[in-house]
């Protein structure tokens, strides 16, 4: 009679974490009499996974009725697979005796475990940056297996190329992590922009995971200022407006100075939003020119999002017919309020 062979038909089996793995094993003969044992690994450090004869193996069930006398199928199912279960499993026939002796081993089945990556988390810089500056975004995803993974960066649907990616650890592990850093150049139009990190892995079946960051949390668009003198509203009254345009975020404080003295301070409230997500705001002063003997230098000083103040000035000619002029000046800080000046914003 032909000698017993132990057949493990599957060279490899791949299972998703949490699922059950079926490991097939059949023998070609009922002789010699003796139990089957399953091991992870071979050699002196092999681990017993299942013993047909004795023992308690709560995660292992037999696929067929292995207790039947004529049974030759010794396939097993291992439940709730984790990445730590990866390895080569051997079905081993023993010859009955005292003790039982190893008779023949199958060729082994390599079990690999697939584990999904966690949702990518994208984080940007701690401090805001202005247009034309380059900022870094990081993307992290964890817990996946096998190690092979693809990560891409996008800005508003356009793929980015300036990034560096590492998968850790470099050696073998039950699961892996990916970390990527992308560099993004900000533009004034980026308030509504998004940076997207996309992770593709064999476990995701072609449906990649995405993590996003809104550039609105990263960008600061400084305002442009324009101070203009409006036509005379009434006798001896001049309306001066300060147009604060294209700024983001909304946090802004405006101070009017008359000849360097603080006249009024207000906080931007009823702003208008532009299509690109930036804001506009206007503040005005009603100046009673009859109260002044000399020309008046009016300065609109804006502190945006905690940054150093920027200002724009306008010279109001008291002696002659008012004419419009504008010049940038450094912020002035003298502190008296001037009467006969009225203001508002819109």
């Amino acid at each position: 009679e032909e000698e017993l062979q132990v057949i493990q038909p599957d060279k490899s089996v791949s299972v998703a974490a949490g699922e059950s793995a079926i490991l097939h094993c059949t023998v070609t003969s009922l002789i010699p009499v003796g139990p089957i044992q399953w091991f992870r690994g071979a050699g002196p450090a092999r681990e017993l996974i299942y013993n047909q004869k004795e023992g308690h193996f709560p995660r292992v069930t037999t696929v067929s009725e292995s207790t039947k006398r004529e049974n030759m199928d010794f396939s097993i199912s291992i439940s709730n697979i984790t990445p730590a279960d990866a390895g080569t499993y051997y079905c081993v026939k023993f010859r009955k005796g005292s003790p039982d002796t190893e008779f023949k081993s199958g060729a082994g089945t390599e079990l690999s475990v697939r584990a999904k990556p966690s949702a990518p988390v994208v984080s940007g810089p701690a401090a805001r940056a202005t247009p034309q500056h380059t900022v870094s975004f990081t993307c992290e995803s964890h817990g996946f297996s096998p190690r092979d993974i693809t990560l891409k960066w996008f800005k508003n649907g356009n793929e980015l190329s300036d990034f560096q990616t590492n998968v850790d650890p470099v050696g073998e592990s039950v699961s892996y992590s990916i970390h990527s850093t992308a560099k993004v150049v900000l533009t004034r139009e980026d308030v509504h922009s998004q940076v997207i990190c996309e992770v593709a892995h064999v476990t995701l079946q072609g449906d990649p995971l995405r993590g996003t960051a809104n550039l609105s949390e990263t960008i600061r668009v400084p305002p442009t200022l324009e101070v203009t003198q409006q036509p005379v509203r009434a006798e001896n009254q001049v309306n001066v407006t300060c147009q604060v345009r294209k700024f983001y975020p909304q946090r802004l404080q405006l101070t009017w100075l008359e000849n360097g003295n603080v006249s009024r301070t207000e906080t931007a409230s009823t702003v208008t939003e532009n299509k690109d997500g930036t804001y506009n705001w206007m503040s005005w002063l009603l100046v009673n020119v009859s109260a002044h003997r000399d020309d008046v230098k009016l300065t609109c000083q804006v502190e945006h999002d905690g940054q150093p103040a920027v200002s724009k000035s306008h010279d109001l000619k008291v002696s002659a017919h008012p004419k419009e002029q504008g010049s940038n000046t450094a912020a002035e800080n003298t502190g008296s309020n001037e009467r006969n000046i009225y203001g508002g914003s819109g």
């Epitope: 690994g41 050699g43 002196p44 450090a45 990866a86 390895g87 051997y90 190893e102 081993s105």
Partner: antibody, heavy 122, light 112 residues
Framework: QVQLQESGPGLVRPSETLSLTCTVS????????WSWIRQPPGKGLEWMGF???????FYNPSLKSRVTISLDMSMNQFSLKMTSVTAADTAVYYC????????????????WGQGTTVTVSS | DIVMTQSPLSLPVTPGEPASISCKSS???????????LDWYLQRPGQSPQLLIY???NRASGVPDRFSGSGSGTDFTLKISRVEAEDVGVYYC?????????FGGGTKVEIK
Amino acid sequence: QVQLQESGPGLVRPSETLSLTCTVSGGSIRNYYWSWIRQPPGKGLEWMGFIYDNGRTFYNPSLKSRVTISLDMSMNQFSLKMTSVTAADTAVYYCARVRAYSGIGLDGTDVWGQGTTVTVSS
Amino acid sequence: DIVMTQSPLSLPVTPGEPASISCKSSQSLLYSNGYAYLDWYLQRPGQSPQLLIYLGSNRASGVPDRFSGSGSGTDFTLKISRVEAEDVGVYYCMQALQTPLTFGGGTKVEIK
């Protein structure tokens, strides 16, 4: 192709601890035994011990009380530490890969490092 | 521990001629699964050992077919059918049945 590279100090003082690392490149650590073997000058080979991918270790009883082998799969490395060295521990130290797929025994030490010479001297 | 004894200690050879090395173990290396857990290694001068034969008679990858292993139980033999100059070095047998793994004392093969 799998390659092994030993690293560590070439000179160790008597009574101190010998520490060597073997870096595995070009292959998997899984399903193999990772062995340390030494060869004193002009003498034969002596098996010191090995570690399996599951962390189980086996040591030569003649050295057991002094030897520890550890495995860092994440770095693709395994290490040897031997305490209380004497001049008799002067040898070429090899790291090696041992195959296992035929039951209880082993199927050959098929990959060897180039060896590193360790001299124990004050 | 299993004691491995090799003979001869030294073996002068003539290129093109056959050569044979004996290895005896203090207990049987033939396991109940039918495998004889014995390896043969060659250590060329100044080099690391290399695996020639495993499980008593299986040639390792890349080993020329002039090398063959035989034997069972406690008596094993390595044969070189036609010695070549590159075959010089020290040959070791090693039992791989149980720990501690143990080597024979070595047989030095040199050209006459």
